[in-house]
Each structure stands twice: as C-alpha cells, then as structure tokens.
C-alpha cells in the first residue's frame, strides 16, 4: 500500500541546481521517509550528510536540493526509504557528472533471471588511458587504452540476482567524480514468473509495467495505472492512482522517476533520454518512448497516452469493441469513522466498468497490512467488499485506505478510523443494604477506564453457580427485588458507549449474601410509662420452631430528638424490658423483632410518653354548649405529653358553699367531652375543669358560668321526676 516515488531531477549534474524528491503518494507513513547515500552501492562516495527538507508542495514528501556550487560533491548513489510494518521499501538512484568520460545507456536496467545482459556505457571523452569498470565499487574489468571502444560493454550471460548492483565506468586516471553509473536490477524469477518458487504466471503488465516477483502485481510506469497498467493517466500526472502532478511548465520534462525494484528508473510517459528532456517522436509513447502505437483504425497516437481510441473502441491498439471502460470510483465512504474496540466489519463500495472483482478490492490498515475481503457481492452498478477485523484496537486508529485496482484504473480513498476503548468500571458496585429478598446497590459506574460517553449501564447479577441476568439501569442507586433468601450473589456493572459493539467488559465483581427469611415480630406488644425516665415494653412469650437461639432486638428512639436511638438485645425467654435512662415528658418510639442468625421482621412502631415532671397545663378550648333545663355539654382539649391520667369537672350552684360542689372524674384522658345531667332549671352554675397527672392537678385560671334553661310547661300537668 506504499506508493513510494523518487524523482531524480536531474541525474546528470552540470552546474545547475539538482534535486531528489521522495514522495509517499496517497500514503500516510507512521515513520518519516528518509533520503540517504547508498553506501551499499558505492562505498567510497562523499560522506557529507544530506540536507533533507520537507517538500512544501506535497503532504508526504522529502527533498534534497543541491545548489550549483555543490556540484562536485553530488556524484554517487542515493536511496529513499519508507517503512511499513517494520519493513523498509527502498528506492535507489544515482547522480553523475554530465562531463563524465562515459555515460550509461540507461540509469537503470531491469532484466529477468536467466537473461543475457549487456550493460553498456557510451564513450563521450577520448583519453589515452585504460578504461575500468566496477560493480558496487569493486573492480571487475579493465580495457587497455588502445582497445577502449565507443560503447563499453559488460556482458552477463544468464543473469542471476547476485549480478544486480551499480556498475560504473571511468578511465583509470579518473575517480568517483568522473564515473558513470548504471544500476542493474535482476528479477529473482525468470520472465513472466513470480512467487517464492517463481512458478506463478505474472499478469501481463502493459505499457512497460514490470511484474513484481514477490507479489505478482504490476509496477506501472509513471503515467499509467490499473491492475495491468493499461489505463493512461491524464497528461502530466503520475502515481498509482494518477493523483500526483508534475508542476513544471512542460509537465514531467526533466523528471526521472524511480520506483521500487524491480521497476528501477524511467522517464514519465512521453519523454526519453538520460535527462528525460527529449519528447517522444511521433508514433512512440510511454516511458523512455519505448512503446510504439499500432492503432487499428489509424487513430491518433498521443505521446503520453498512446492510441486515442474513438467512441466504442478500447485496448492498447483500439482493437476491442464494446462498452468503454470506466475508472473505478469509491462510493459512500465517510471521511471519519468512530468504532469500538472488538470485531469490526468495514465495507468498501465501488463503481466502475468492468465492475471491480473481489481480488481487486483491498483495505489497507495504517501499519500497511493489506486486508482481502471476507465477503463480496455486487449489483448492476456497484461492487461491495466486506472486510473482517476480528479485533480492532486503539493502535489501529489512523488513516485506512480503501483501494480498488482494475484494468480500468486504480483509485484509493483514505478515511480516518478512531478506535475507542470500551468503558469498564474501575470499582465493583457497592451493596448499600440487603434483605432476604432485595438488595440496594450503588453501581459505582464512575470512575471508569476507557472512552465515554456512557450511553447506558447494565447491572449484571446472579446467584453463584448460575447464569447471569441483567437489568438496564439509569441511576446510580438501584434496588434488586425478588432475590432468593440466604443466597450468595455476584454483581458487576457493564458500561455501554455509543455505536455497534459498544458494550464494555463488565467491571470487577462484588459478592454479597441475602438474609434468611426472618421470624415474625413479638406478639401482644405493649408500651407503657413506668416513671418519668422509664417505659415498660411487654410482649407475649415467644415460641419458635427453629432450633436456633434467638433474642429480641428492641429499638427505641425519641420522637423529638431523632438521634437519640438505642438498640437493646433482650434474651428470648423474657417477655418485657424496662427502657430507662429516658427523659421525662418525652415521647418515644419503640419497635421490636426476633432475631436468630437471620434478622426478623420489625414490629409496627409503638409510641409512649414518659411520665411528666411538672403539673399538667390546664385543658384548653373549654366550651359548654347544648345547655338545656337540666343538661349541659362540656368539651375541652388537652396538650399531649404531660401524662394526663384524668380530667376532673367540678360544678356547683352559684352562691352555695365551696364544699357543696360535685366532682366528675373522667379517667380516660382521651375523652374530650362530657354531658352534665340532673341540673336544676333556671339555675346558674360555676364549672371548673382540671387536668390531673402523676404530679398533681392543673390550676384553673377562672370558672365558667352557665345558666340552665327554664323547665318546659307541663302539658300533662304536674312534674315528673326522672
């Protein structure tokens, strides 16, 4: 997936500025691309470090520019290197003096294993010296001074991979800086073969494309693209998808393009010569003008694209009739995708004609791994490739590339994938309270490890040794109901973030045990005041079927001061407990339960006041109503909390002696009215009401005065005494 291109402009160095530009086209390297001197090829070349700068005109490109005054230091071999998945892809090139004594026929030469090879250098300067030839800086051949031909040749019968290298020629009196260089590239396999054992047939690479011996893919010359290099780019463009453009006024003139081995270096289509500054003559096209147009219907020959076929015709020579080819297009691929760690099934959808096949669609991860589709389908207009990444992880975040390469051309679409870490709580949920059939849980979803936002939460729970169940929860506090008593439970929380597969790994597990089903509360509970500082709680004797020991737990608290709470354990064989050290005139609440190992059920709450330490206040709201000739209705209210045990109503006829009063004592303090009877008609009475408690009676401030009505006329004559 690395489209690395090295532009050598120009390989023959004169006194003009010269440069090397290395472009990682359509590819986003993790590690920087580097340009360096190739000491493997030439050991004794100049040692000066190179001034490598960013090529500002391109996103991923490095450049070395030599000013004219540095011309003498330039001769030698260079490389550009990009790394992907720990593997280096290295492109090599050379620069030599234009005034060298010899010049190579070509900058590089690619041959197949077993080919008969002639490496040739053209003599451009005549000297009375022996000519010498080196391979990678090591001497291989000399030609006596009187025998130096116009074309100096190295003959390599039956070429082998070890023959590959940089061959240089010069006169013996010269040096590296007067040497001419050419690089021989020997494919590991024989012609039209590739694979580890060189037994697989290559795709026929058109337009001088070269079959890569390790992948079987065509490396296309600059200006052509597609699986077979049949598709010509727009003029002055290059790169695997023809996205790069030559910025010169004459397009790619004077640009020598070097691509990964086994391609080597060539001019862009339409140009030839060691400096790539000669246009192709009519009838020729392609890299180094090595291709000839043989247009079937005498179509025009374009030096960049070859035969320009008329409507309805296609092929290199416009020899095929049919639907015109359409460069593939990638459809409906967003620029940015957020995915959750885990299984991921990215989809690449492409149009074009012919429709891309499964083998022609790939997905490239940021580290350069190339994925093949796991599933594939197509409609009339689209091919859809579905890829499978079994476990996508945050390091896989970055620029992924959907790549489609057909005979009609190649297209790549980068898109950004941001892989999120699934959230996982750092802490186990906390059990706030439990009963025999419920538990109150704080799910403790914060803090968590991983990425938010949290879309939802699941509380998983199960009795130990059973399957997990879960409930969807919104709040931090959750009540689990319908639990089994006296059972060990496990709890954990799963957090869910947005998107497919957003369920994180459940967090740490909390264990808890539900209570046993408790005994019922004591029966016949009664709470009565004992003194100013004590209450007495009594109950009926307790009988249980359980063998377990039991006790009565009594809990009491003051109604006025809620904090004053106390729990008392009472042996199970007792039927009462004295609650002492209480405050006088204070209302207390009490409840009780019978506990074994398990806690019992609480009784209803009982309330009582301790006895008063002061006289009671007077009854309030005293009213005397419904007065007749011999009755009157007295009503009142009393204030709670003074241990009022009885109400006394005292009345006497006005003018009578004090000791001639009548007292009515009402011993039920909850009664709040009383009807006086047997009064005399048309008589005035003084009525007093007192409240009585353990200390004494209240003091009435004033007496009420009432007058009975006259007796009704006796219709039947005479009085009747009832």
């Amino acid at each position: 997936a690395m489209d690395l291109i090295l532009i050598n402009s120009l390989p023959l160095v004169s006194d003009a500025e010269t440069s090397l530009t290395c472009i990682a086209s359509g590819w986003h390297p993790h590690e920087p691309i580097t340009i360096g001197r190739d000491f493997e090829a030439l050991m004794n070349q100049h040692q000066d470090p190179l001034e490598v700068t960013q090529d500002v005109t391109r996103e991923w490109a490095k450049k070395v520019v030599w000013k004219r005054e540095k011309a003498s230091k330039i001769n030698g071999a260079y490389f550009c290197e990009g790394r992907v998945r720990g593997q280096a892809i290295r492109i090599r090139t050379m620069k030599m003096r234009q005034q060298a004594s010899f010049l190579p026929a070509t900058l590089t030469m690619t041959v197949d294993r077993g080919d008969n090879v002639n490496i040739s250098f053209k003599k451009v300067l005549i000297k009375e010296e022996d000519a010498v030839i080196y391979k990678n800086g090591s001497f291989i051949h000399s030609v006596p001074r009187h025998e130096v031909p116009d074309i100096l040749e190295v003959h390599l019968p039956h070429a082998q991979p070890q023959d590959a290298g940089v061959y240089s020629a010069r006169y013996i009196g010269g040096n590296l800086f007067t040497s001419a260089f050419t690089r021989l590239i020997v494919r590991r396999c024989e012609a039209q073969k590739w694979g580890p054992d060189c037994n697989r047939p290559c795709t026929t690479c058109k337009n001088n494309g070269v079959c890569h011996e390790d992948t079987g893919e065509c490396i296309c010359p600059p200006g052509f693209m597609g699986r077979t290099c049949e598709k010509a780019c727009e003029p002055h463009t290059f790169g695997r998808t023809c996205k790069e453009r030559c910025s010169g006024s004459e397009g790619c003139k004077s640009y020598v393009f070097c691509l990964p081995d086994p391609y080597g270096c060539s001019c862009a289509t339409g140009w030839r010569g060691l400096q790539c500054n000669e246009a192709c003559p009519y009838g020729h096209y392609g890299p180094d003008c090595k291709l000839r147009c043989h247009c079937t219907n005498e179509e025009m020959c374009d030096r960049f694209q070859g035969c320009l076929c008329s409507q309805g015709w296609q092929g290199l020579q416009c020899e095929k009739e049919g639907r015109p080819r359409m460069t593939p297009q990638i459809e409906d691929l967003p620029d940015h995708i957020e995915v959750n760690s885990g299984k991921f099934n990215p989809i690449c959808k492409a149009s074009g004609w012919p429709l891309p096949t499964s083998e022609e669609m790939t997905l490239v991860k940021p580290d350069g791994t190339v994925l093949q589709p796991n599933d594939f389908n197509h409609t009339d207009h689209f091919s859809v490739a579905i890829f499978t990444v079994n476990r996508i992880l945050p390091p896989d975040s970055g620029v992924w590339v959907c790549s489609v390469n057909t005979v009609a051309g190649m297209v790549e679409k980068p898109f950004n994938i941001s892989v999120k870490v699934l959230p996982e709580p750092l802490h186990a949920p906390n059990v706030i309270d439990t009963g025999h059939n419920f538990a109150i849980i704080n799910i403790s979803s914060e803090p968590y490890f991983g990425d938010g936002p949290i879309k939802s939460k699941k509380l998983f729970y199960k009795p130990v040794n059973q399957a997990w169940k879960y409930i969807q929860v919104m709040n931090e506090i959750v009540t689990l109901n319908y639990l089994e008593p006296r059972t060990d439970y496990e709890l954990c929380v799963q957090l869910v973030r947005p998107g497919e597969g957003g369920e994180g790994h459940p967090g740490p597990v909390r264990r808890f045990t539900t209570a046993s089903i408790g005994l019922p509360p004591p029966r016949g509970l009664s709470l009565l005041p004992k003194s100013q500082t004590a209450l007495n709680l009594t109950w009926q004797p307790i009988f249980t079927s359980s063998e377990d020991e039991f006790y009565v737990e009594v809990e009491r608290w003051s109604q006025q001061t809620r904090s004053d709470q106390q729990n008392i354990k009472v042996p199970g064989n007792l039927t009462s407990v004295l609650l002492n050290n209480l405050l006088p005139r204070e209302q207390y609440s009490v409840r009780a339960r019978v506990n074994t190992k398990a806690q019992g059920e609480w009784s209803e709450e009982l309330r009582a006041w301790t006895l008063s330490d002061i006289l009671p206040p007077q009854p309030e709201n005293i009213k005397i109503t419904n007065i007749t000739d011999y009755t009157a209705l007295v009503s009142w209210t009393i204030v709670d909390g003074y241990s009022i045990s009885s109400i006394i109503i005292r009345y006497k006829v006005q003018g009578k002696n004090e000791d001639q009063h009548i007292d009515v004592k009402i011993k039920n303090a909850t009664i709040t009215q009383y009807q006086l009877k047997g009064l005399e008609p048309e008589t005035t009475y003084h009525v007093d009401i007192f409240a009585e408690n353990n200390i004494g009676s209240s003091n009435p401030a004033f007496s009420q005065e009432i007058r009975t009505l006259p007796a009704p006329k006796d219709l039947g004559g005479g009085k009747m005494l009832l």
Partner: antibody, heavy 119, light 107 residues
Framework: EVQLVESGGGLVQPGGSLRLSCAAS????????ISWVRQAPGKGLEWVAR????????YYADSVKGRFTISADTSKNTAYLQMNSLRAEDTAVYYC????????????WGQGTLVTVSS | DIQMTQSPSSLSASVGDRVTITCRAS??????VAWYQQKPGKAPKLLIY???FLYSGVPSRFSGSGSGTDFTLTISSLQPEDFATYYC?????????FGQGTKVEIK
Amino acid sequence: EVQLVESGGGLVQPGGSLRLSCAASGFTFSGSWISWVRQAPGKGLEWVARINPYDGNTYYADSVKGRFTISADTSKNTAYLQMNSLRAEDTAVYYCARNNRFPTWFDYWGQGTLVTVSS
Amino acid sequence: DIQMTQSPSSLSASVGDRVTITCRASQDVSTAVAWYQQKPGKAPKLLIYSASFLYSGVPSRFSGSGSGTDFTLTISSLQPEDFATYYCQQSYTTPPTFGQGTKVEIK
C-alpha cells in the same frame, strides 16, 4: 554449497599427456569463469588458464600456450585441462578455482591434484 | 605481464601483534588486487578483493587498502590461526599474476 573437486593428477613422463577434471556444484556453472592455478612444490601460485563455460572463451598463460587446452562441459558442470607435451617444470599441485562472474579473484578453490612429471 | 612484488617474504610475529604486508604492482592496476591466505597442504582462501573489500566470512581483523600500484594487507591483532602464507594477486589484465608470498611465522 559451492564445491570444486579436481581429479586426474598423477605421475607422467616428460612429453606425456594428462587430463585433469574439475567437477563443479552449488552454483550456476555457465555464469562463472573457471580457472586452473598451479603451485610448484615450495613455490608460489601461478595462473594457468581460464574458460567461460557459457560461450567457451579461453585464455592461457604464455608458459602453457599451445600445450594445454582448457574446456568445459556445461551439461556435466565440469571443466577440463588437457595437458600435452608435459615438462618437468609443469610438476605442481593443480587447483581448479572459480572466478565467479568476472575473471578477477578466485573465491572458491578445489583441494588440488598433484601432477608429477618425471622420468 | 604485470609483476606483483610482495614484502617482506617472511616475518615473525607474536599473537596480538599488528602485522602489515605490502604488495607493489609494476603498473597502475586501479584497485584490482586480491589477497589470499594459504596453509600448508591446503588450497588458498580469499580474504580481500578489489583492494579493500572484505570477503564474506573473513574476520574483521583483516583489512586491505591501496590503489594504483601500492597495496597493503593488515592483520590488526594476530591470532594463532593466522600463521600462514599470504599472497597478493592482480586481476587488472590477463594473465592474472600473484606475488611470491609472505610467510607469517610464530616468533
């Protein structure tokens, strides 16, 4: 693994003939040069002849020119040195050596075979 | 033919010593010089080619230098297995020629 194995040495009378063989293995025979180098007892090394098995090109030291013939059979990956009109000064250990791609240095040598020319 | 003259013809040295052997060509041979090691009863072994290139598998204590007519073989720290006879050879023209050899002996 590159191997060169010489054979055919022995005792021969002056004026006699002998044919040495060099069986090669472990490399592309037709893509290399094969040389014969000799070493007289207690003396230094002397190059004798070389051949390019691919095209049959041959070269000889002046001391053996016209008497010795180097040849190669690419089907058998074997080089030969036919020695005629042998002289006492031809007595030496004869080594078969590979020049690899170019007729420069000798990167692999055989174990040598002794040729004694004596009456 | 090009004559190769080696010096010294023999030398005595101890283990750990730095040893230098020189070879002079009768004419400019560029860097077309190789060095070989030979032990008694054995075939020679290539050490250095093209004047300064170390042949694969040869210990790095061996090094070569020179260009034109003067060449040097250096053993930086002599080891017991290095006691042998050393030859230089030019391959600049045919016939290839050897120096007369330098015998390195134990002192």
